[in-house]
Amino acid sequence: VPRWRQQWSGPGTTKRFPETVLARCVKYTEIHPEMRHVDCQSVWDAFKGAFISKHPCNITEEDYQPLMKLGTQTVPCNKILLWSRIKDLAHQFTQVQRDMFTLEDTLLGYLADDLTWCGEFNTSKINYQSCPDWRKDCSNNPVSVFWKTVSRRFAEAACDVVHVMLNGSRSKIFDKNSTFGSVEVHNLQPEKVQTLEAWVIHGGREDSRDLCQDPTIKELESIISKRNIQFSCKNIYRPDKFLQCVKNPEDSSCTSEI
């Protein structure tokens, strides 16, 4: 008799998930000398242990603590770039501006970027058919809890001037329901972070609006100011400069050092 399996609303675990995580870990530790000590098999075991045999709607941050411990990494706290709804451009920027880091430039962020995973209660199987959707099913699912955990830790580590790249083409430039708006903003440490500087990236060629006056940016400013952190917002009108650099990252036009 085939065993009944829960049908979730979201896509299932990314195919070849264990192999992908392991391969990414090996690649990352080869490229980043400061992480060469990491044992990737142990990392995978800790990752797996966070969600295997557990109900995929009942995952906690505690479940990920062994993984967090193994993936502990020091990035320069004054070189952190957060982002919201503009991941690709943020990643292109840090590919070029090598001394700045997004969460996905760290080991744990790199391992999980663009992947989906979940298990099943009381079985050691990975569910490749479906996983819980954050809205339709539950928020305490393996993927959401992972990103909430690593995002919180990343924001807590930040210091001095923290930059965030925001998408000026969206109706909500700042969305308080995004990971940035719901987690990172609230975990910046006022005793360490002096300023949050938002870069609002314009999409249109002839766009000369001041998107820093957008109501959602005012909302962000209010939240940040109440946390005793200074806020700054800059309009960025030429994102094509980043794209040029992705094609040719060694070029001199791809560094802010003048």
Partner: antibody, heavy 120, light 107 residues
Framework: QVQLVESGGGLVQPGGSLRLSCAAS????????MNWVRQAPGKGLEWVSY????????NYADSVKGRFTISRDNSKNTLYLQMNSLRAEDTAVYYC?????????????WGQGTLVTVSS | DIELTQPPSVSVAPGQTARISCSGD??????VYWYQQKPGQAPVLVIY???KRPSGIPERFSGSNSGNTATLTISGTQAEDEADYYC??????????FGGGTKLTVL
């Protein structure tokens, strides 16, 4: 080191035309936005025009729109400014200037300038 | 379009601090750049991105930008700092603008 050398300036009558050139060296010319900026005698700086790295996007100050055309030849590392229907108020030193990288939009390097005099 | 307003002239005694202002609506929302120009010479970038100094520019040059005003500060002003100073910003499209310039006199 970065070098920008303008040429093509001179005396021209009102209504006449002139083509300025800017020879670039010491950097990957095809990767940068390039600009023309001018300065009338005893006056301040005025941005004239910019062009993006592949030459597909240009923009002009209102004062020259429809009369001036910026272009570039990346194979020759050269920037151009074609100036038509010249007026007395176009008299100025014309500078070629290279853009700053990434999120910054200013002028990292300037040429020494070429003088354009529009007079009858 | 934003308009940038600078004082026509500023005077300072040698060794003292000179401050040159540049004002415009919501200027804090845009990066500001400062250029130094000596007679008969091309302008030179001294500050970019509000407060960053290009290599080769002395540490006595600094910049800030808040509210509607950006400020270029020259600490311990020297005779060689006597020049015209221009602020500049970019507000998208065809809106690349300079201030009118400030003549700095070192007394």
């Amino acid at each position: 080191q970065v070098q920008l050398v303008e040429s093509g300036g001179g005396l021209v009558q009102p209504g006449g035309s002139l083509r300025l050139s800017c020879a670039a060296s010491g950097f990957t010319f095809s990767s940068y936005y390039m600009n023309w900026v001018r300065q009338a005698p005893g006056k301040g700086l005025e941005w004239v025009s910019y062009i993006n790295p592949n030459g597909m996007m240009t923009n002009y100050a209102d004062s020259v729109k429809g009369r001036f055309t910026i272009s570039r030849d990346n194979s020759k590392n050269t920037l151009y400014l074609q100036m038509n229907s010249l007026r007395a108020e176009d008299t100025a030193v014309y500078y070629c200037a290279r853009d700053l990288p990434l999120v910054y939009t200013g002028f990292a390097y300037w040429g020494q300038g070429t003088l354009v005099t529009v007079s009858s | 379009d934003i308009e940038l307003t600078q004082p026509p002239s500023v005077s300072v005694a040698p060794g003292q601090t000179a401050r040159i202002s540049c004002s415009g609506d919501n200027l804090r929302h845009y990066y500001v750049y400062w250029y130094q120009q000596k007679p008969g010479q091309a302008p030179v970038l001294v500050i970019y991105g509000d407060s960053k100094r290009p290599s080769g520019i002395p540490e006595r040059f600094s910049g800030s930008n808040s509210g509607n005003t950006a400020t270029l500060t020259i600490s311990g002003t020297q005779a060689e700092d006597e020049a015209d100073y221009y602020c500049q910003t970019y507000t998208g499209g065809a809106s690349l603008v300079f201030g009118g310039g400030t003549k700095l006199t070192v007394l």
